[in-house]
């Protein structure tokens, strides 16, 4: 075949996804390597081709887009898994070409398993909260594009193994989790489980991030914004929170 601009294996994009969950993976060419987008390329008569190399194999092979229930499909510059399987792990290549032009890049995809407390080999994003700085929020990450705005998903938030409910200072609000006043005891891993329907099937997305409570911006105590729990000094609130956590450990261990 004619020469192709090969950007090699883009290890900066080590994509990790959970087993048995939907995954949408954009071809990195348009995001990081080329100066034009998919629509422009498509209008110019360029075709996007996908193939892959299985884990521990050298052979490049086409992706099977004829699986039952269209488990793997391509939509514009996105490769869809509905859902992933463990043996989808491998290096994926997207190639943009026509008779006179060719450019391609490969990237690794790792399908990982989670345990009953959402622990996994997944590398977790870290979200910093400022200690005692008033209301701050985290948002369930990387769920855009999985379902249209007309679909209203259900969301459950967890801290570690524990469903977040009746926490003193942490309030689930759909895709957001609000910290009324961030305390050191709020350090930990937070998981959102998003459930949504699509074409007569139900899918689940699991997203975990690490919350790190740090000193206020600019040093000092910062200036807390008005807050419904201001009447409770932070140590008192912390005592309540710790006592509740002990109670949850006794009554709701490994709550799913």
């Amino acid at each position: 075949s004619e020469r192709c601009d090969d950007w090699g294996l883009d290890t900066m994009r080590q994509i990790q996804v959970f087993e048995d969950e939907p995954a949408r993976i954009k071809c990195p060419l348009f995001e990081h390597f080329l100066k034009f987008n998919y629509s422009t390329a498509h209008s110019a008569g360029l075709t996007l081709i996908w193939y892959w190399t299985r884990q521990d194999r050298d052979l490049e092979e086409p992706i099977n887009f004829r699986l039952p229930e269209n488990r793997i499909s391509k939509e514009k510059d996105v490769l869809w898994f509905r859902p992933t399987l463990l043996n989808d792990t491998g290096n994926y290549t997207c190639m943009l070409r026509n008779t006179t032009y060719c450019s391609k890049v490969a990237f690794p995809l790792e399908v990982v398993q989670k345990d009953s407390c959402f622990n996994s080999p997944m590398k977790l994003p870290v979200h910093k909260l400022y200690i005692e700085y008033g209301i701050q929020r985290i948002t369930c990450p990387n769920v855009d594009g999985y379902f249209p705005s007309s679909v209203k998903p259900t969301i459950t938030w967890y801290m570690g193994c524990y469903k977040i409910q009746n926490f003193n200072n942490v309030i689930p609000e759909g895709m957001n989790l609000s910290f009324l006043i961030a305390l050191i005891s709020n350090n930990g891993n937070y998981t959102c489980v998003v459930t949504y329907p699509e074409n007569g099937r139900t899918f689940h997305l699991t997203r975990t991030l690490t919350v790190k409570v740090v000193g206020s911006p600019g040093g000092g105590s910062g200036k807390p914004i008005p807050n419904p729990l201001l009447g409770l000094d932070s140590t008192g609130l912390n005592d309540i929170f710790e006592a509740q956590k002990i109670e949850w450990h006794e009554h709701h261990h490994h709550h799913h």
Epitope: F18, E19, D20, E21, P83, L85, L86, Q113, K114, D115, S116, C117, T154, I155, T156, Y158, K163, Q165, N166, V193, T195, T202, H204, T206, H251, H252, H254, H255, H256
Partner: antibody, heavy 119, light 107 residues
Framework: QVQLQQSGAELARPGASVKFSCKAS????????MQWVKQRPGQGLEWIGT????????RYTQKFKGKATLTADKSSSTAYMQLSGLASEDSAVYYC????????????WGAGTTVTVSS | DIKMTQSPSSMYASLGERVTITCKAS??????LSWFLQKPGKSPKTLIY???RLVDGVPSRFSGGGSGQDYSLTISSLEYEDLGIYYC?????????FGSGTKLEIK
């Protein structure tokens, strides 16, 4: 499609133990919880417990601790429930049901296994 | 344990009629509630989860609602295949607990 196939009816003596199965197909067995539910003849539903086959983590309702033991075999995608020290009140239909974290904890149910305890 | 009080325990209704069944929890269950239908000799079928979400394949005449401690299941226009026993389940906390059931029969 997702299916849970439960093993056939069991007849057991008082004091004996019985172990029955729930074979999963059509989905990734290790990614979902398996729930177990008891229904005595003419009575309502009673939750026994749950297991996450991915790591074997279990939860039981207090009443069934020591009575029911939940296990899972990943290689065969099969969940098991063992009942020990059988008594007449253990005569019932036992259902397995698949569930996920948080939102949809019961979606697909097995057809049930009938256990009869009789001397 | 959270106690789920379901009412009525049995009811008669005509085909085409609007039917409502209620479930009251002994404490706030944060919409972690499912509804099931069990027909004689069959395993239960999940209808609704998280109080108001219809399971795929369940007819749209079924709807759920409620919050806090009080929840309801409504059938907008009763059909023959809807007859059976309806159960609610709370899964807000362990142990999960079912309501005692509502037997729905033809008037």
């Amino acid at each position: 499609q997702v299916q849970l196939q439960q093993s056939g009816a069991e007849l057991a003596r008082p004091g004996a133990s019985v172990k029955f199965s729930c074979k999963a197909s059509g989905y990734t067995f290790t990614s979902y919880w398996m729930q177990w539910v008891k229904q005595r003849p003419g009575q309502g539903l009673e939750w026994i417990g749950t297991i996450y086959p991915g790591d074997g983590n279990t939860r039981y309702t207090q009443k069934f601790k020591g009575k029911a033991t939940l296990t899972a075999d990943k290689s065969s995608s099969t969940a098991y429930m063992q009942l020990s020290g059988l008594a007449s009140e253990d005569s019932a239909v036992y259902y397995c049901a698949r569930g996920y974290f948080g939102n949809l904890v019961f979606d697909v149910w097995g057809a049930g296994t009938t256990v009869t305890v009789s001397s | 344990d959270i106690k789920m009080t379901q009412s009525p325990s049995s009811m008669y209704a005509s085909l085409g009629e609007r039917v409502t069944i209620t479930c009251k929890a002994s404490q706030d269950i944060n919409t972690y509630l499912s509804w099931f239908l069990q027909k004689p000799g069959k395993s239960p079928k999940t209808l609704i989860y998280r109080a108001d979400r219809l399971v795929d394949g369940v007819p749209s005449r079924f709807s759920g609602g409620g919050s806090g401690q009080d929840y309801s299941l409504t059938i907008s226009s009763l059909e023959y295949e809807d007859l059976g026993i309806y159960y609610c389940l709370q899964y807000d906390e362990f142990p999960y607990t079912f309501g005692s059931g509502t037997k729905l029969e033809i008037k």
